[in-house]
Amino acid sequence: NFMYSKTVKRLSKLQEYQQYYPSLTCVMEGKDMEDWSCCPTPWTSFQSSCYFISTVMQSWTKSQNNCSVMGADLVVINTKEEQDFITQNLKINSAYFLGLSDPKGWRHWQWVDQTPYNKNVTFWHSGEPNSPDERCAIINFRSEEWGWNDVHCHVPQKSICKMKKIYI
């Protein structure tokens, strides 16, 4: 009976989310393997988040709006582990917008989701950021490593979206 009611609840939750995401990929987790955590297909998952790499070349603002329509934001990177996971799926000859910008050019960097910008947890390439006119951040591969660079916000780039996992 307990299992039946849990299944019914899950199905109704799945139907609710199906309006927004035609397909979800779910895995069982939790100490009793009774919780399901899901990401939209074909997003990838790491810890409590889902990630989508957009290969559409768009400006930073349009990229953020595009993520927003999908219930996400441009990616906020909190740890080296998270960055290492994300970069496994990136192409080394491409650049991807992050959810990091400095709209006034005052070198006051801010994350799209209002996460405090912590200078100690940043992965700028050597010598970056280097121009007050370059007010948006990308991640790219340079000098044998992945790192961040400041670029013009209006120049079209690929992008990475991030959203919280859906729990059912």
């Epitope: 768009q58 400006s59 930073w60 603002t61 349009k62 953020q64 709006n65 910008s101 709209p103 006034k104 050019g105 121009s131 007050p132 006119d133 007010r135 948006c136 013009h152 916000c153 209006h154 120049v155 079209p156």
Partner: antibody, heavy 121, light 111 residues
Framework: EVQLVESGGGLVKPGGSLRLSCAAS????????MSWVRQAPGKGLEWVST????????YYPDSVKGRFTISRDNAKNSLYLQMNSLRAEDTAVYYC??????????????WGQGTTVTVSS | EIVLTQSPATLSLSPGERATLSCRAS??????????MHWYQQKPGQAPRLLIY???NLESGIPARFSGSGSETDFTLTISRLEPEDFAVYFC?????????FGGGTKVEIK
Amino acid sequence: EVQLVESGGGLVKPGGSLRLSCAASGFTFSSYGMSWVRQAPGKGLEWVSTISSGDSYTYYPDSVKGRFTISRDNAKNSLYLQMNSLRAEDTAVYYCARQIYYDYAYYFDFWGQGTTVTVSS
Amino acid sequence: EIVLTQSPATLSLSPGERATLSCRASESVSFRTSHLMHWYQQKPGQAPRLLIYGASNLESGIPARFSGSGSETDFTLTISRLEPEDFAVYFCQQSIEDPPTFGGGTKVEIK
């Protein structure tokens, strides 16, 4: 006082080439992105090309891509536009303009007086 | 590319009257509190001159009778009382994404 002075315009046959120059003074040229904007007779404004302050980024509309090349010489405070394979539809007044970044975009705060390019046989 | 449509194409008014010029974008040129539309004035035989940046910010040296407003896709340039020197062509411009684009212009002429 900020000044932008274009030169190099003239009459050229279709398929010909011209090199426009823009001499900048009154500001630290190397700190600013620059653009060329043109205006065909009796028409509106059309952006032609952009170059970033450090020369790392250039951009062109499809209408001139592969034919026009923007460049700059920060030591000489000069902006250039090399125009090859010119067509009748390239006939216009060409302005150089200074870019000012504002939030996620930019605007043009100073413009030169323009130089006229006429493409005709 | 983002297409900017200005209306009306021509505005016939008398000195002292109020002028209201419209610019509509094919998609939003705003992001949160940033409204990324700019306005220029052009007189015959002259280069364009910046009037308004960021939808509502008056450029230094521009008279206070000029004002701008709007967000997302709809923007307005208002001249509260037309002076003889205000009769000219006005262009809107966006650069939130490349390529930067201009509207087709509104000519403000003497009635």
